[in-house]
Structure formats: C-alpha cells, structure tokens
C-alpha cells in the first residue's frame, strides 16, 4: 500500500512539475523591466525565451518573436535547449510511469517490469527537473550579470547633455515558476525511485533441507520464491485496484487596429 502511495504521489508531483516546466518555458515574463530606482516610464518591457513584449500605459501590448537563431545569445539558446530537454524527458517519463503505476494493470506485466519502468521514469524526472533548474539558473545568472553591467552605465550620452535611459531587467515570474516546477519534478523523480525499491522482487534463496520420512529419503529444494514486499508489508493476499483515470488540474486593453503579435 505504501509503495502504491509513494509511486502515485511521485507521479502526481512530477506531473505538476512538468506542467510547470512547460508553463515556464512558454511564459513571456522570464525577465521584467526593473522599476526600482528607475525613471517612471509609461512603457513596461518584459522578455521570454521566444519573444519580447512591451505593455504601454494605454494597455496595448505588443510582442515580437525572436525570428533569428544565429543572432541570439548562446546562453539564451542553451536555456531553451535545457528547458526543451527537460520537457521531452519529463513527457517520456510520464508516459513510462503511467504504465509502471501499481494501480494500473496492463496484461500480465510482472512486478519486476513495473519496478524497472518506475526506476526509469524516476531517473527521467530527476534529470528533467535538473534540466529545468539548470536552465532557469543560467538565465537568472545572465540577468544578474547584465543588471550590474547596465547599472554601471545606467546613463549614456554625449557629456551627459542628452541622456539615454538603459532598460534594466530583473527576475520575472517564469523564473520562480521554473524553479518550483523543476524542484517538484525532481522530488517526484526521487519518490518514484524510492517506490521502485519497494516494487523490486527480492530473490529469497533457502538452503536445501533434508526431510526424512519413514523409509523414504527425499531431498526437497525449494526454488527462489518471488516476494513482492511493500516495505515489509504482507502481500500474500494481494488485491489489484483498478484506479480510475485521475485528472489534475492589468489591464487596460486598447481596441486593436493592427495585429502585431
């Protein structure tokens, strides 16, 4: 029972985590304009992995995609790659873990196969979570570096006569979503690996014992019994539960004259 709970919880936590990683990857607010100690502008800038956006006081928001691959910073490309790898591994991990769930019976799949699949999905979730955390952390580091660089030359211009305000960017909501989601996926993966230990069949080998019956000398050598131990729980009278499918669950806008997005 404890194994099923651990496995199920690991699956759900990973599912939420991967959904979060997908959401973070798609979000536009990876970096947002720093409003602290900045001249009050009527324009708010924010950037994602795929496009940059500008929201005016009027509420009109204009987003422009990065329609170049070669022109983008290598770090941004690396972050994109890490997040995509995280999503792909997580998605495969989810697919594998569905079949590995103890509460779902698929033909005559043995516990050893389920244990292997659980371990595989667990490792995938761990790597997926690490990819997401790494991606978000690389981006955050890039932001911190750029922030202090732009602070050093906040105002540039000809002898200070004409000033150009340099937009500084700080952490956006997507970073926090990514960190939390990556962490959840990682935790889910660890839980799956722990559940795998409980699912793994243990070969119990008994030494040969001689039974002396009247007049007959019979040597009885039992084979290795398959013991499905759920953390020491008695699983002699196993009940298979067919679990039902679980489902997880400002702004002023200016009437558009043009489509910019």
């Amino acid at each position: 029972m404890a194994v099923t709970a651990c496995q199920g919880l690991g699956f759900v936590v990973s599912l939420i985590g991967i959904a979060g990683i997908i959401a973070a990857t798609c979000m536009d607010q990876w970096s947002t304009q720093d409003l602290y100690n900045n001249p009050v502008t009527a324009v708010f800038n924010y950037q994602g992995l795929w496009r940059s956006c500008v929201r005016e006081s009027s509420g009109f928001t204009e987003c422009r995609g990065y329609f170049t691959l070669l022109g983008l910073p290598a770090m941004l490309q690396a972050v994109r790659a890490l997040m995509i790898v995280g999503i792909v591994l997580g998605a495969i991990g989810l697919l594998v873990s569905i079949f590995a769930l103890k509460c779902i019976r698929i033909g005559s799949m043995e516990d050893s196969a389920k244990a292997n699949m659980t371990l595989t999905s667990g490792i995938m979730f761990i790597v997926s979570g690490l990819c997401a955390i790494a991606g978000v952390s690389v981006f955050a580091n890039m932001l911190v570096t750029n922030f202090w660089m732009s602070t050093a030359n906040m105002y540039t211009g000809m002898g200070g006569m004409v000033q150009t305000v340099q937009t500084r960017y700080t952490f956006g909501a997507a970073l926090f979503v990514g960190w939390v989601a990556g962490g959840l996926t990682l935790i889910g993966g660890v839980m799956m690996c722990i559940a795998c230990r409980g699912l793994a069949p243990e070969e119990t080998n008994y030494k040969a014992v001689s039974y002396h019956a009247s007049g007959h000398s019979v040597a009885y050598k039992p084979g290795g019994f398959k013991a499905s131990t759920g953390f020491g729980s008695n699983t002699k009278n196993k009940k298979i539960y067919d679990g039902g499918a679980r489902t997880e669950d400002e702004v002023q806008s200016y009437p558009s004259k043009h489509d910019y997005v």
């Epitope: 304009q33 009050v40 009527a42 324009v43 800038n45 940059s52 009027s58 009109f60 002023q252 200016y254």
Partner: antibody
C-alpha cells in the same frame, strides 16, 4: 464612433470648487485610460495626468497634486476632474482625452472653459 | 521632467510648399524593448481641441492625410507637411509619451506666407 462630451463652461469665484465631467460613448469605457489636459488662454497644452479607468488608479503631473482630483463613474461611463480652492491661474480650457497607441491622446473632448473671477 | 523644445516658434510657408517642424527632447524617447520612439504630434486649430496626427514618431493616425509624415529617433524628431494646404494652418505640438509626466512642446504656429 468614439465620442467624449464634456460639461459646459463654468464661472467660479476664487476659493470655490469645480467638477468637470467627461462622458464617453462609442466604446467600452474601461478600455481607455482618461487623460486631462489644461490650456490657459493663448498658451500651450499642459498634461495634468490620467486615470486608469480599469483600476481607478490616478497619475498626476507635478503641478497638479493636491487640489486636483481625477475620479470616474464606470456605470455612467464618465470621468471627472475636480479642482478645489480655485485660483486665478486655474482659469483655462480643460480637455479630457483617451489613451491610444503609443500612449498618445487619441480622442479628445470638446473642452470645458473654467473661468475664475471675483 | 522631460523638456520638449520645438523649433521654430512660428513658421510661414507658401501653399504647396514643404513645411518642417522640429522637436527635441531632453532624454531619448526610444524604448529598447520594441525599438519604438514614444513621441506624438498633434494639430490644433483655433477654437478646437487638438487632433492626433502621428504616434510612435512616424505612424500616421488613420484618416490623417499622407502629406503629414513624422521622422526621427532618440531625441530629435521632425514633422513634415510635404505640400501645405490652406486647412493645415494651425498650431502643432509634439508630446513625450515615454516618461511621466507626458510633457508637450511649446507649440509651433504654422501660417501661410
């Protein structure tokens, strides 16, 4: 089409208060922020500030804090400008205007002349 | 506050001729996020409210004749009327729409020579 209709001219004494209204029609009132602009006789335009008609939050230009208050009635699609403790220098034409693309003032009311005379 | 300086204060141009009004801001109005300049041009005729001509420094408002064009970037901007018509006699204002407060230029009075 978008229309902003302002209240009629006002003649006030120094120290009194005045409330200028700006009724919007032809669009969803909360979709456009409402700006207020002052123009003294024979002078240029002076941006007073704006009210976010979605949140009700107001932003005032430096010389227009304290005696000047922007408000609105969403149900009536009307924005208001209230000036208290009127002074002679407050005598001007007051315009309301909606925020458009590029934070420009896209549509303007016809203006309300506020005369301050003892 | 951002200071918007228009030049000249008044301008007399013959009908059919080109009229050019300049506007200079004390800080750049270029937003790096979308590479747009937050400068707007208005036309005000006597006894009327101002009328929006150009926003984002160069985008003409719908219904505005194409003889009106805006150019410039950063701190220096220009409004050009390619062929002056009698109905173009008015006062023209530029406005900063990037920094609060949204300051206006002092205005340029355009007359027919």
């Amino acid at each position: 089409q978008v229309q902003l209709v302002q209240s009629g001219s006002e003649l006030k004494k120094p120290g009194e208060s005045v409330k200028v209204s700006c009724k919007a029609s032809g669009y969803t009132f909360t979709n456009y922020g409402m700006n207020w602009v002052r123009q003294a006789p024979g002078q240029g335009l002076e941006w007073m500030g704006w009210i976010n008609t979605y949140t009700g939050e107001s932003t005032y230009a430096d010389g227009f804090t304290g005696r000047f208050v922007f408000s609105m009635d969403t149900s009536a699609s009307t924005a208001y400008l209230q000036i208290s403790s009127l002074k002679a220098e407050d005598m001007a034409m007051y315009f309301c205007a909606t925020l458009g693309y590029g934070n420009s003032l896209a549509y303007w009311g016809q203006g309300t002349l506020v005369t301050v005379s003892s | 506050d951002i200071v918007m300086t228009q030049s000249p204060d008044s301008l007399a141009v013959s009908l059919g001729e080109r009229a050019t009004i300049n506007c200079k801001s004390s800080q750049s109005l270029l937003n790096s996020g979308n590479q747009r300049n937050y400068l707007t041009w208005y036309q005000q005729k006597p006894g009327q409210p101002p009328k929006l001509l150009i926003y984002w420094a160069s985008t003409r408002e719908s219904g505005v004749p194409d003889r009106f064009s805006g150019s410039g970037s950063g701190t220096d901007f220009t409004l050009t009327i390619s062929s002056l018509q009698a109905e173009d006699v008015a006062v023209y204002y530029c406005q900063n729409n990037y920094f609060y407060p949204f300051t206006f230029g002092q205005g340029t009075k355009l007359e027919i020579k």
